[in-house]
């Protein structure tokens, strides 16, 4: 009889342990669900707020038509300038028209005055041809005014309202360009 009671007690204890485990699993599952819900809500909130606040250009960038421009506050050599732009999802400024050149030089006058700013233009060492960083040729009116006497690689920069050339290893400010976000509205 005593053995029977002891067996029942053990079975009950086993059942109790199983129920405790199930409860623990349920609590964990509930907590996981709550966390996921929280994450989901946060994600939705972020998506909504970023959609609401999405301007065509990031903070501290200037917009003109389909482009966003960033005028650097640091100096660097041409190659490092390019890498700094890439970190921001942009490339060095590529001037496609006189209108764009006028916008850039006008903006620079307002922001900083007469400094040197690297753009994405360089001179091929073999052919002597000027090419933008994407391989396209500048329009005739947008060729650097003076040929640099440097034996080293030569790159283009903007100063005041002119496009000039200099040794790529000199330190200058730089201008980055990226495409403006199109409004989906």
């Amino acid at each position: 009889k005593l053995l029977q009671v002891s067996t029942i007690a053990m079975q009950q204890q086993e059942k109790l342990i199983q129920q405790e485990r199930a409860l623990l699993n349920f609590t964990e599952w509930k907590r996981s669900c709550a966390l996921q819900m929280k994450y989901c809500q946060a994600f939705m909130q972020n998506s909504l707020s970023s959609a609401h606040n999405s301007s065509p250009c990031p903070n501290n960038w200037i917009q003109n038509r389909e482009s966003c421009y960033y005028v650097s506050e640091i100096w660097s050599i041409w190659h490092t300038s390019q890498e700094n732009c890439l970190k921001e999802g942009s490339t060095l400024l590529q001037i496609e028209s006189k209108e764009e050149m006028d916008f850039i030089t006008g903006s620079l006058r307002k922001i900083k005055g007469s400094y040197d700013y690297w753009v994405g233009l360089s001179q091929d060492g073999h052919s002597g041809r000027w090419l933008w960083q994407d391989g396209s040729s500048p329009s005739p009116g947008l060729l650097p005014a003076e040929r640099s006497q440097s034996a080293n690689q030569v790159c283009g920069y903007v100063k005041s309202n002119s496009l000039l050339s200099s040794n790529c290893s000199t330190w200058k400010y730089f201008i980055c360009e990226k495409y403006a976000l199109r409004s989906s509205v």
């Epitope: 890439l86 970190k87 960083q133």
Partner: nanobody, 115 residues
């Protein structure tokens, strides 16, 4: 963290073509641009070609008109199509992912152009 895996390197004759691939995995949302590098004289590495997430491209002068960088956003992969290869293009080509805070490098893939 971002992981990069390059492929497509090999031995090719001068004038031939190769296509390098660089597949990104991990925290890919933080990537703003990707580029291909190779060793350069007097410098550690030179940027051969790069492409931003917006599709803007940049090339070193010596490969303009011969190499084309492109991307497949769905596959998180960047390609470097190398045409009219020259012996001086021989190098280990490494892929780099640009993020605002950190740069991530792949292991590199060997390209050998024989004359």
């Amino acid at each position: 963290q971002v992981q990069l895996q390059e492929s497509g390197g090999g031995l090719v004759q001068a004038g031939g073509s190769l296509r390098l691939s660089c597949a990104a995995s991990g925290s890919i949302d933080s990537i703003n641009a990707m580029g291909w590098y190779r060793p350069a004289l007097g410098e550690q590495r030179e940027l051969v070609a790069a492409i931003t997430t917006g599709g803007r491209t940049a090339y070193v002068d010596s490969v303009k008109g011969r190499f084309t960088i492109s991307r497949d956003a769905a596959k998180n992969t960047v390609y470097l199509q190398m045409n009219s290869l020259k012996p001086e293009d021989t190098a280990v080509y490494s892929c780099k992912a640009f993020t605002r805070d950190t740069d991530y490098w792949g292991q590199g893939t060997q390209v050998t152009v024989s004359s």
